[in-house]
């Protein structure tokens, strides 16, 4: 499934929303990396439209900020992309997933890094 700003037509949902998520995932990326966040819906069923929010502000898709079903990609990340990201159910603002993202000045070595 390709990421991008193209629209997707959605059919009927299978389930109502599940419980809110527990803890926040902490991620570290290097400058210039692509920040990739994934948030599968609880219970596995569609939950209506979703929105990605950074530091309380809704993210709008662009050439650099790509959204897909339950996924977010921020290309060519810089320090300004650091912050608290959440994937929320658009309708209720119920938080589905929570991420703390830190973009370091140094480019990534290519290995996956775990935040503390």
């Amino acid at each position: 499934e390709s990421l991008g700003t193209e629209q997707r037509v959605v059919g009927r949902a299978a389930e109502v929303p599940g419980p809110e998520p527990g803890q926040q995932e902490q991620l570290v990326f290097g400058s210039g990396d692509a920040v990739e966040l994934s948030c599968p819906p609880p219970g596995g069923g569609p939950m209506g439209p979703t929105v990605w929010v950074k530091d309380g502000t809704g993210l709008v898709p662009s050439e650099r900020v790509l959204v897909g079903p339950q996924r977010l990609q921020v290309l060519n990340a810089s320090h300004e992309d650091s912050g608290a990201y959440s994937c929320r159910q658009r309708l209720t603002q119920r938080v589905l997933c929570h991420f703390s993202v830190r973009v370091t000045d140094a480019p990534s070595s290519g290995d996956d890094e775990d935040g503390e």
Partner: antibody
């Protein structure tokens, strides 16, 4: 001041097509979710379709699925509804409705004045 | 028939308090917010209540919303003649993957 101005309504024969437009001003159009809601003469409100900027998703009411297509042109601040294979029961006033900011609970906080679509032979 | 059920009509005298109900299910009201809209004769709908009980700026505090389980209510206190209108509840329905409206309640101020 937020303004939504629908156009494109009129009389069309059953099986025909029509494209409605909604010109938006007074807000950053590309950042907001938008919907079409219709009201048949003397009847209640019926949500038709919504287009969601946060994840690029589009939803339709079962009654129009496969016949209507919602789209937007952010460069023109305009929302569209392409209506094909029109039926008599599609006769209604069609309203364009703006949703709340994407980091707030969804609701239709501004509405256009509506455009009348009449499907009749 | 609408997914959300409202009484077709309600009435009251000036100064009275009236309540309009909206009944749904776990796939809509039970797991989602409810909003209420007022439609004066010959005009477009106007948002009255959102997120079950919040009022947009400019809406008098005579209007209030509440929700319990799969039902919601709109209360109008200190009824005025200008409140005569149609009132609609709305919510997203997860099983239909779309918004649903109640059939509307015509409020008459006697």
């Amino acid at each position: 001041e937020v303004q939504l101005l629908e156009s494109g309504g009129g009389l069309v024969q059953p099986g025909g097509s029509l494209r409605l437009s909604c010109a938006a001003s007074g807000f950053t159009f590309s950042s907001y979710d938008m919907s079409w809601v219709r009201q048949a003469p003397g009847k209640g409100l019926e949500w038709v379709s919504g287009i969601y900027s946060g994840d690029g998703s589009i939803y339709y009411a079962d009654s129009v699925k496969g016949r209507f297509t919602i789209s937007r042109d952010n460069s023109k601040n305009t929302l569209y509804l392409q209506m094909n294979s029109l039926r008599a029961e599609d006769t209604a006033v069609y309203y364009c409705a703006k949703d709340a900011p994407t980091n707030e609970p969804s609701r239709f906080d501004y509405w256009g004045q509506g455009t009348l679509v009449t499907v009749s032979s | 028939q609408s997914v959300l059920t409202q009484p077709p009509s309600a009435s009251g005298t000036p100064g009275q308090r009236v309540t309009i109900s909206c009944s749904g299910s776990s796939s809509n009201i039970g797991n989602n917010y409810v909003s209420w809209y007022q439609q004066l004769p010959g005009t477009a709908p106007k948002l009255l209540i959102y997120a079950d009980s919040k009022r947009p700026s400019g809406v008098p505090d005579r209007f209030s919303g509440s929700k319990s389980g799969t039902s919601a209510s709109l209360a109008i206190s200190g009824l005025r003649s200008e409140d005569e209108a149609d009132y609609y509840c709305a919510s997203w329905d997860y099983s239909l993957s779309g918004y649903v409206f109640g059939g509307g309640t015509k409020l008459t101020v006697l």
